[in-house]
C-alpha cells in the first residue's frame, strides 16, 4: 500500500525490571524527512482532539527536544531511515505498547511495538535433539529472547550442577528481525550420562545468578554387562564343571535378547543369563563372553579366558631350515599341544638322546655335515609325559670340496696352440651338475669338466675352474704362461717435446707393450731402407729432407712385429719463394695481371705481404695479387714475403712489363 509508512522491527521485545531494551528499527516515510517524533507509552487516539493521548516517554520536534525521560529513553534514529530506540533501565510498568508517532511535512504515522517487562529475569529455554545416543555428538541449544547493548549477560552450562568442560559458542542477535542470545554446546554423551540433569544458567556480567532452565538427559545406549565365572581364575582340568553368569548393569531402552559367544562365535541354545559347562574337554578352552541386545544394538561383556589343562600330546619336530647349508645356523622346534605348556623336553639325534638339551628349541649355530640325520623329541608338563613323534630329517648340503684345475698339455705353451684343461674335485652334496671357467671365452667343452682352448691367445695368462652344485667352488687359477711375439710396437717421439723444426736434434723411440720371452732385437726403416738396430733412432740436426714415413720392428724367438708407419713432419720457415705471373711477365695495359707468391713451407704460409720495386707495401694479404685493369706505370719489379708460425721468407724480384695497347699507340 503506497499510502503507508514502511517499518521493520521485532513485534515484541522482552526484558525484566532493571535491565534494558534495545529496539532495532528501520522506516521509510511517505514524503520528505522526519520533522517530529514522539514516543508514547500505551497511546490512545482522542477523536475530539484528533490527537494521541498517553505518557510521552520521548519527544523530538523542529523546535528541539522536550526533556521528559530523555536520559532513560533515547532515540538513536535519524530523519529518514533509522528509528532505533533504547530504554535503560527498563521498569515493570514499561510493559505494554510503545507508540512511535512520526510526522513529516505533509504526512503522519503511528507505529506500535509491544514491550513485555517481567518482574524477575525470565528463564532461558534448552532445546535438545529428538534422540540422544551414546558417543554420538549432539548440539545442546540454550535460547533467551533477550539482548541489550547496555546490559551484558552470559549463559553457562552445568551437568549435575558442575560447569561442563566443553566450550560453548554464544551468539547474539540484535536485528530488526529478531532479538535473542543463544549458547550452543557440542557434546558427546556417554551411557553414564543417562538420567543426569543439564542446566543452562543465565548470569549477569559479574556471574551472578539470574535464572535457569534444566532438562534430564535420556541417553540411549547398548546394554552394559558384567561377567562372573566359577572357578574365578577360569583354570580347570578335563572333566571339571564351569559356571558363567551375565549381569546387566544398565540398558536404555530395556534389553530384549541374551546370547553367549566362544572365540567370537555364538553358542547354540544358550539364551539365559547363566552358562553351565559340565565335564569340560580341552576343546572347550577359549575366550567366552555374553551378549545382550536392545533397540540400540548389542552390548558385550569383557572376555573370560577358560583354560582346560591336559598332558602333552605326541610331539613333532620342525626344522628351520632343511636342507641346511654347511656353516649356517639351524633351529629345531619341539611342537606338542599341552596345557599348561611343557616344562621339560628330551631330544634325540638318530635315536640317541642328546645330552643337556631340555628346552623347546635346540639351536646349532654352525652346521657341519655330521649333523645330518633324524631328530625327535618328548614333551613333559605337570600332568604327564607325552609320546615321541616320528621325528624330522636334516639334510646338510655343502659346495664341492678340494677343486683343482689341471693343464693336460706339455709345456711351454705358445700363442695359437690348442690347450686342454680338466676340473677335478673331492666330494659334493648335492652332486656336481655343471662347471664354470674364468675368464669366459668362446671355448669348447668336449665333456663335463674338460675345457679345450683352440688357438690360445697371448693374453690368456691364468685359467680357473669351478665345480658347481647349488654353489660353485673355485679352484686356484693355473698360469698358462703363453709365449708370444712382441706386441703393440709403435714409434714414439721423445725429443723434442714439441713440434719438430728444421735443425732440431730429434730422437725416436721404438716402444712395445710386452714380449714373452723378454729378449728382443730392434730394426728401423724408412721407405724400405734399414736405418739402425737400436731401440732409439737419433738425428743431430733434422732437415726437411728427413721428413717421411718411419717404421720399427721388434723380434724375439717366437716372431717379429712391425710398428704402424709413423710420419715425421719437419716444420720450417717459408723457403724457395718466387713470384710467378699470369698470363705472363708481359701484359697489355687494360688487361688483368695476376701475381702468385709460390713457396715451400711447413706449415703452409698463413700470411703474404707484397712489395713493389721501391719496397713499398701493397694492401694485399693473399697468395695472389690481381691488378685489373693493369696500367703501363705498373711495370716494375715486385716481390713477396711469406710468413708461417716458424718464420718469414722472401722472394727475389720478378719484373712485370706492361705494354701499350694498339688503341693507345694509335692515339699517339
Amino acid at each position: 500500500d503506497s499510502s503507508k509508512w514502511v517499518f521493520e522491527h521485532p513485534e515484541t521485545l522482552y526484558a525484566w525490571e532493571g535491565a534494558c531494551v534495545w529496539i532495532p528499527c528501520t522506516y521509510r516515510a511517505l514524503d520528505g524527512d522526519l520533522e517530529s517524533f514522539i514516543l508514547f507509552h500505551n497511546p490512545e487516539y482522542n477523536k475530539n482532539t484528533s490527537k494521541f493521548d498517553g505518557t510521552r516517554l520521548y519527544e523530538s520536534t523542529k523546535d528541539g527536544k522536550v526533556p521528559s525521560e530523555q536520559k532513560r529513553v533515547q532515540f538513536l534514529g535519524d530523519k529518514n531511515k533509522n528509528c532505533t530506540l533504547s530504554i535503560h533501565p527498563v521498569h515493570l510498568n514499561d510493559s505494554g505498547q510503545l507508540g512511535l508517532r512520526m510526522e513529516s511535512k505533509t504526512e503522519k504515522w503511528m507505529e506500535r511495538i509491544h514491550l513485555n517487562v517481567s518482574e524477575r529475569p525470565f528463564p532461558p529455554h534448552i532445546q535438545l535433539p529428538p534422540e540422544i545416543q551414546e558417543s554420538q555428538e549432539v548440539t545442546l541449544t540454550c535460547l533467551l529472547n533477550f539482548s541489550c547493548y547496555g546490559y551484558p549477560i552470559q549463559l553457562q552450562w552445568l551437568l549435575e550442577g558442575v560447569p561442563m568442560r566443553q566450550a560453548a559458542v554464544t551468539s547474539t542477535s540484535l536485528t530488526i528481525k529478531s532479538v535473542f542470545t543463544r549458547s550452543e554446546l557440542k557434546f558427546s554423551p556417554q551411557w553414564s550420562h543417562h538420567g543426569k540433569i543439564v542446566t543452562c544458567q543465565l548470569q549477569d556480567a559479574d556471574g551472578k545468578f539470574l535464572s535457569n532452565d534444566t532438562v534430564q538427559l535420556n541417553v540411549k545406549h547398548t546394554p552394559k554387562l558384567e561377567i562372573k565365572v566359577t572357578p574365578s581364575d577360569a583354570i580347570v582340568r578335563e572333566g571339571d564343571s564351569v559356571t558363567m553368569t551375565c549381569e546387566v548393569s544398565s540398558s536404555n531402552p530395556e534389553y530384549t535378547t541374551v546370547s553367549w559367544l566362544k572365540d567370537g562365535t555364538s553358542l547354540k541354545k544358550q539364551n539365559t543369563f547363566t552358562l553351565n559347562l559340565r565335564e569340560v574337554t580341552k576343546d572347550q578352552s577359549g575366550k567366552y563372553c555374553c551378549q545382550v541386545s536392545n533397540d540400540v544394538g548389542p552390548g558385550r561383556s569383557e572376555e573370560v579366558f577358560l583354560q582346560v589343562q591336559y598332558a602333552p600330546e605326541p610331539s613333532t619336530v620342525q626344522i628351520l631350515h632343511s636342507p641346511a647349508v654347511e656353516g649356517s645356523q639351524v633351529e629345531f622346534l619341539c611342537m606338542s599341544l599341552a596345557n599348561p605348556l611343557p616344562t621339560n623336553y628330551t631330544w634325540y639325534h638318530n635315536g640317541k638322546e642328546m645330552q643337556g638339551r631340555t628346552e623347546e628349541k635346540v639351536h646349532i649355530p654352525k652346521i657341519l655335515p655330521w649333523h645330518a640325520g633324524t631328530y625327535s623329541c618328548v614333551a613333559e608338563n605337570i600332568l604327564g609325559t607325552g609320546q615321541r613323534g616320528p621325528g624330522a630329517e636334516l639334510d646338510v648340503q655343502y659346495p664341492p670340496k678340494k677343486v683343482t684345475t689341471v693343464i693336460q698339455n706339455p709345456m711351454p705353451i705358445r700363442e695359437g696352440d690348442t690347450v686342454t684343461l680338466s676340473c677335478n674335485y673331492n666330494s659334493s652334496n648335492p652332486s656336481v651338475t655343471r662347471y664354470e671357467w674364468k675368464p669366459h671365452g668362446a671355448w669348447e667343452e668336449p665333456s663335463l669338466g674338460v675345457l679345450k682352448i683352440q688357438n690360445v691367445g697371448w693374453d690368456n695368462t691364468t685359467i680357473a675352474c669351478a665345480a658347481c652344485n647349488s654353489w660353485c667352488s673355485w679352484a686356484s687359477p693355473v698360469a698358462l704362461n703363453v709365449q708370444y711375439a712382441p706386441r703393440d710396437v709403435r714409434v714414439r717421439k721423445i725429443k723434442p717435446l714439441s713440434e719438430i723444426h728444421s735443425g732440431n736434434s730429434v730422437s725416436l723411440q721404438c716402444d712395445f707393450s710386452s714380449s714373452h720371452p723378454k729378449e728382443v732385437q730392434f730394426f728401423w726403416e724408412k721407405n724400405g731402407r734399414l736405418l739402425g738396430k737400436e731401440s732409439q733412432l737419433n738425428f743431430d740436426s733434422i732437415s726437411p729432407e728427413d721428413a717421411g714415413s718411419y717404421s720399427c720392428w721388434v723380434n724375439n724367438s717366437i716372431g717379429q712385429t712391425a710398428s704402424k708407419a709413423w710420419t715425421l713432419e719437419v716444420l720450417y720457415a717459408p723457403r724457395r719463394l718466387r713470384v710467378s705471373m699470369s698470363p705472363g711477365d708481359q701484359v697489355m695495359e687494360g688487361k688483368s695481371a695476376t701475381l702468385t707468391c709460390e713457396s715451400d713451407a711447413n706449415p703452409p704460409v698463413s700470411h703474404y705481404t707484397w712489395f713493389d720495386w721501391n719496397n713499398q707495401s701493397l694492401p694485399y694479404h693473399s697468395q695472389k695479387l690481381r691488378l685489373e685493369p693493369v696500367k703501363v706505370q705498373h711495370s716494375g719489379a715486385y716481390w713477396c714475403q711469406g710468413t708461417n708460425s716458424v718464420g718469414k721468407g722472401r722472394s727475389p724480384l720478378s719484373t712485370l712489363t706492361v705494354y701499350y695497347s694498339p688503341e693507345t699507340i694509335g692515339r699517339r
Partner: antibody, heavy 125, light 111 residues
Framework: EVQLQQSGPGLVKPSQTLSLTCAIS??????????WNWIRQSPSRGLEWLGR?????????DYASSVRGRVSINVDTSKNQYSLQLNAVTPEDTGAYYC?????????????????WGQGTMVTV | QSALTQPASVSGSPGQSITISCTGT?????????VSWYQQHPGKAPKLMIY???NRPSGVSNRFSGSKSGNTASLTISGLQAEDEADYYC???????????FGTGTQLTVL
C-alpha cells in the same frame, strides 16, 4: 685531425653517370701508407665496398666485381681529393655513398679497417 | 662474394653484457686476422670500434672487445649503456676478387 668532406649531386637520372668527390684534409692522397676507398650503403644490399685508389711508386686502383667495368676512381693531387664515377646508373644504385681511409698500421701490416669516413652523400636514382 | 652473417637484432638491459656474432668462411673470417667492427647511429657514418679481430682504436671504450674462433668473429659489449644503442657491422678481408666484405648488420636495443 684527418677529415674527409664529400660533395656531389643527390639526384641522378637512370643511365646517367654518378660523380662524387672526396676532399682530404690532415693527410695526403699521395701517402704511401693509405688507401682511399668508396663504400655505399642501401637497405637491400647493406654496406658494400666499391673500390679504392692508392699511391706507392705509382698509382693503383681496385674495384668490386659487382661494379667492375662501369666504375672508375680518379685523383686530383693538386686539390688533394679523389672522386668516384659510376656509369649507366639504375634505381638499384640508390643509397648512401661514403668515402673512407684504410691505413697501414705498423711498418708493413695492413689492418684493412676504415678508420676515417666522410659524412656520406644520399644519392637517389 | 656473400655478405658475412650477423643476427638481425640483439637486446640487453643497462649494465648487462651482450655478444654479436659474425660468421663467414675460410676465405674471409677464418683465413685472415683482419676482422673489423663498426658502430653506426641513425643518419651518421659508420665508426671503427675494433680492427685486426681484437684491437681497439684510441678513444674507443674498453667496454668493447673482439675475438675470433674458426670462421666466426664476435663483438662483446660489457656494462651496456643507453648510448650503445646503434647498428653494428663486421667486415673482413677476403681472398676473392673483391678484397673486402661486410656483415649483414645487427640492431642493438638497450632496454
Amino acid at each position: 685531425e684527418v677529415q674527409l668532406q664529400q660533395s656531389g649531386p643527390g639526384l641522378v637520372k637512370p643511365s646517367q653517370t654518378l660523380s662524387l668527390t672526396c676532399a682530404i684534409s690532415g693527410d695526403s692522397v699521395l701517402s704511401n701508407s693509405d688507401t682511399w676507398n668508396w663504400i655505399r650503403q642501401s637497405p637491400s644490399r647493406g654496406l658494400e665496398w666499391l673500390g679504392r685508389t692508392y699511391h706507392r711508386s705509382t698509382w693503383y686502383d681496385d674495384y668490386a666485381s659487382s661494379v667492375r667495368g662501369r666504375v672508375s676512381i680518379n685523383v686530383d693531387t693538386s686539390k688533394n681529393q679523389y672522386s668516384l664515377q659510376l656509369n649507366a646508373v639504375t634505381p638499384e644504385d640508390t643509397g648512401a655513398y661514403y668515402c673512407a681511409r684504410d691505413r697501414l698500421q705498423d711498418g708493413n701490416s695492413w689492418s684493412d679497417a676504415f678508420d676515417v669516413w666522410g659524412q656520406g652523400t644520399m644519392v637517389t636514382v | 662474394q656473400s655478405a658475412l652473417t650477423q643476427p638481425a637484432s640483439v637486446s640487453g638491459s643497462p649494465g648487462q653484457s651482450i655478444t654479436i656474432s659474425c660468421t663467414g668462411t675460410s676465405s674471409d673470417v677464418g683465413g685472415y686476422n683482419y676482422v673489423s667492427w663498426y658502430q653506426q647511429h641513425p643518419g651518421k657514418a659508420p665508426k671503427l670500434m675494433i680492427y685486426d679481430v681484437s684491437n681497439r682504436p684510441s678513444g674507443v671504450s674498453n667496454r668493447f672487445s673482439g675475438s675470433k674462433s674458426g670462421n666466426t668473429a664476435s663483438l662483446t659489449i660489457s656494462g651496456l649503456q643507453a648510448e650503445d644503442e646503434a647498428d653494428y657491422y663486421c667486415s673482413s678481408y677476403t681472398s676473392s676478387s673483391t678484397p673486402y666484405v661486410f656483415g649483414t648488420g645487427t640492431q642493438l636495443t638497450v632496454l
